[in-house]
Interface confidence: low
Amino acid sequence: SGPLPKPSLQALPSSLVPLEKPVTLRCQGPPGVDLYRLEKLSSSRYQDQAVLFIPAMKRSLAGRYRCSYQNGSLWSLPSDQLELVATGVFAKPSLSAQPGPAVSSGGDVTLQCQTRYGFDQFALYKEGDPAPYKNPERWYRASFPIITVTAAHSGTYRCYSFSSRDPYLWSAPSDPLELVVT
């Protein structure tokens, strides 16, 4: 009959967690599950419960998590991995817009994330978007060019900096930058 379908794993309120702040990981499978297993990859930590509450985020808790469930003697496929990121580990970068934060529709703008540290990775978030701009050509660079700006690009942006050596330990977020498309 094949393996059971994979559950979903989410972090509430967000998978970006400031140090010392709480977060809840929730594994969701079908009704009537016999047993859940929630584990932190690359470690020996796991629990046989669907909900993991972290009352105060620590550096050591950042990383990749996944979960699965058991019905009878059958185990499900594992959930998609969840990347739990600790933020505020390093000082915030600065975010600026070139040539400026007000741009005409159809124009070009580049969002530039700058840090005093020698970080090699940067993430750019737009408020309301569920995930960062993570395209490979943007992910590894401090500049995020937006070609042919539209009204949809209007909004509040923040960036983070971090190192590829510790990809789940991020800086504090930059001060917000308001991009206005006229």
Partner: nanobody
Framework: QVQLQESGGGLVQAGDSLRLSCAAS????MGWFRQAPGKEREFVAA????????NYADSVKGRFTISRDNAKNTVYLQMNSLKPEDTAVYYC?????????????????WGQGTQVTVSS
């Protein structure tokens, strides 16, 4: 890394009271375990991060009370009506899972232990 430091152990007579303290370098779900000579480590009590939930071993229910002061990052074990069979090294432990578990495997961090001896 979480640092846990127990204090308050000592030698008392049966029927006396003791209060153990555990200072933690962070706020976690916490537990107390004990280990008597030649025996396995056993669960005593646990308390949730907020202090709203507790769990006790049957052998200490009604005699021991676990509590916490999050402002001081300290957990307490008030032990009343002590018996000779309560003699053990008492260990404070911290869990990243807020489930007041009685399972040793649920606890990630451990203190060095404090000796409690109850004479008859």
């Amino acid at each position: 890394q979480v640092q846990l430091q127990e204090s308050g152990g000592g030698l008392v007579q049966a029927g006396d009271s003791l209060r153990l303290s555990c200072a933690a370098s962070g706020t976690y779900s916490m537990g107390w375990f004990r280990q008597a000579p030649g025996k396995e480590r056993e669960f005593v009590a646990a308390i949730s991060w907020s202090g709203g939930r507790t769990n006790y071993a049957d052998s200490v229910k009604g005699r021991f009370t676990i509590s916490r002061d999050n402002a001081k990052n300290t957990v307490y074990l008030q032990m009343n009506s002590l018996k000779p069979e309560d003699t053990a090294v008492y260990y404070c432990s911290a869990a990243i899972y807020d489930n007041v578990s009685s399972r040793i495997g649920s606890y990630t961090y451990w203190g060095q232990g404090t000796q409690v001896t109850v004479s008859s």
